[in-house]
C-alpha cells in the first residue's frame, strides 16, 4: 500500500491502494466513497460534497448523506444550510413557504423575521 502514497488519490490517506484509493483517513479528514458502476474508490476530504455532511465517529470520520427533506446541503444530520430550489431555509429546515411572521429573502432563499 505504501507504494501508492505519492498518488494524488491517496492524499490524506492512512491506508491507500491503486485500485480502491483511500480506505482510511487522517484524523481530521472525512472519508467519502465514490461508486462508479460496480467499482468504488475512497477519498479523504477536508469538507464533504454537496448533499453530504461531516459525521465524526471514533474509528473514522466520514461524509454522510443529508436526509433533511428538500435540503441540498447540511451542516449536520438535522441542520440544513441550503435548500433545494423553490424551498426556503428556516432554522435548519426547508419549507415551501416561510412560517407566519417571517418573510422570504429571495437572494438567499432564507426566511427572515419581519412582515410579509
Amino acid at each position: 500500500r505504501a507504494s501508492y502514497v505519492s498518488n494524488p488519490i491517496c492524499k490524506g490517506c492512512l491506508s491507500c491502494s491503486k485500485d480502491n484509493g483511500c480506505s482510511r483517513c487522517q484524523q481530521k479528514l472525512f472519508f467519502f466513497l465514490r461508486r462508479e458502476g460496480m467499482r468504488q474508490y475512497g477519498e479523504c476530504l477536508h469538507s464533504c460534497p454537496s448533499g453530504y455532511y461531516g459525521h465524526r465517529a471514533p474509528d473514522m470520520n466520514r461524509c454522510a448523506r443529508c436526509r433533511i427533506e428538500n435540503c441540498d446541503s447540511c451542516f449536520s444530520k438535522d441542520f440544513c444550510t441550503k435548500c433545494k430550489v423553490g424551498f426556503y431555509l428556516h432554522r435548519g429546515r426547508c419549507f415551501d413557504e416561510c412560517p407566519d411572521g417571517f418573510a422570504p429573502l429571495e437572494e438567499t432563499m432564507e426566511c427572515v423575521e419581519g412582515c410579509e
Partner: antibody, heavy 125, light 107 residues
C-alpha cells in the same frame, strides 16, 4: 413504522419459476434502495439482489441471468422474478430496505436497516 | 469476492457477562461493516453500521469497532434477550457478503 411483508413463496420443481413480492409501508418507498437476502435452512445469510431508488439493478454471480429484481413505486412494492430454479435456491427469502451498491450514503442505508419476516421457497422434485 | 470470517462460531455466556465477537475481512473494507442480530424463526435486525454507529433504538450495551480488516462487536453486559445469532456484513463492495454467524447461547 417501517413494515415489509413478503409473499409468493412456495414449492416449485427444479427449472421452474416463482415471483416473490414485498409490500412496503411506513416510509417513502421511492426514495430508498431495496434488497433481497436469502437464508438456506440452517445456514447463514446470502445477498441475492439490490435495486436503487432510480431502478439500477445488481446481482451476485450465483443468480445473475436467472433472477430479476424490479420495483413499482406507485404500489410501494418490490419484486423478485426467479427463473431456472435449482435445489440450492431453497431458502427463506427476505426483503430488506437499503443496500444500494451504486450509491454511497455514509449512513444506515449502506447497510440493510429493516427486514421483512421472510417467505419460504422450496425447490424440489 | 470479500470473505468475512467470524469467530467464534458459538459461545456460551451468563447474563451480565461481557461478550466479544470478531469479524475478519479478506481485504480492506474501510469501516464499511454492519452487524445484525437474528433470533430463531425471525428476520435479522440491524444493530451497527459503518463499524461503530448504533442503529435507531439499539441499546447502548451494543458497540462496534474496527477498520481495515478487523472488526469487533461487543455486548458489555449480555441480557436474556441478547441470546441469538450475530452476523457481520461488509457493505464496501459488491457482492455484499456476510460472516457465517456467531451463536450466543445461555451458559
Amino acid at each position: 413504522e417501517v413494515q415489509l411483508v413478503e409473499s409468493g413463496g412456495g414449492l416449485v420443481k427444479p427449472g421452474g419459476s416463482l415471483r416473490l413480492s414485498c409490500a412496503a409501508s411506513g416510509f417513502t418507498f421511492s426514495s430508498y434502495a431495496m434488497s433481497w437476502v436469502r437464508q438456506a435452512p440452517g445456514k447463514g445469510l446470502e445477498w441475492v439482489s439490490s435495486i436503487s431508488s432510480g431502478g439500477s439493478t445488481y446481482y451476485p454471480d450465483s443468480v445473475k441471468g436467472r433472477f430479476t429484481i424490479s420495483r413499482d413505486n406507485a404500489k410501494n412494492s418490490l419484486y423478485l422474478q426467479m427463473n431456472s430454479l435449482r435445489a440450492e435456491d431453497t431458502a427463506v427469502y427476505y426483503c430488506a430496505r437499503g443496500g444500494d451498491p451504486g450509491v454511497y450514503n455514509g449512513d444506515y442505508e449502506d447497510a440493510m436497516d429493516y427486514w421483512g419476516q421472510g417467505t419460504t421457497v422450496t425447490v424440489s422434485s | 469476492d470479500i470473505q468475512m470470517t467470524q469467530s467464534p462460531s458459538s459461545l456460551s455466556a451468563s447474563v451480565g457477562d461481557r461478550v466479544t465477537i470478531t469479524c475478519k475481512a479478506s481485504q480492506d473494507v474501510s469501516s464499511a461493516v454492519a452487524w445484525y442480530q437474528q433470533k430463531p424463526g425471525k428476520a435479522p435486525k440491524l444493530l451497527i453500521y459503518w463499524a461503530s454507529t448504533r442503529h435507531t433504538g439499539v441499546p447502548s450495551r451494543f458497540s462496534g469497532s474496527g477498520s481495515g480488516t478487523d472488526f469487533t462487536l461487543t455486548i458489555s453486559s449480555v441480557q436474556a434477550e441478547d441470546f441469538a445469532t450475530y452476523y457481520c456484513q461488509q457493505h464496501y463492495s459488491t457482492p455484499w457478503t456476510f460472516g457465517q454467524g456467531t451463536k450466543v447461547e445461555i451458559k
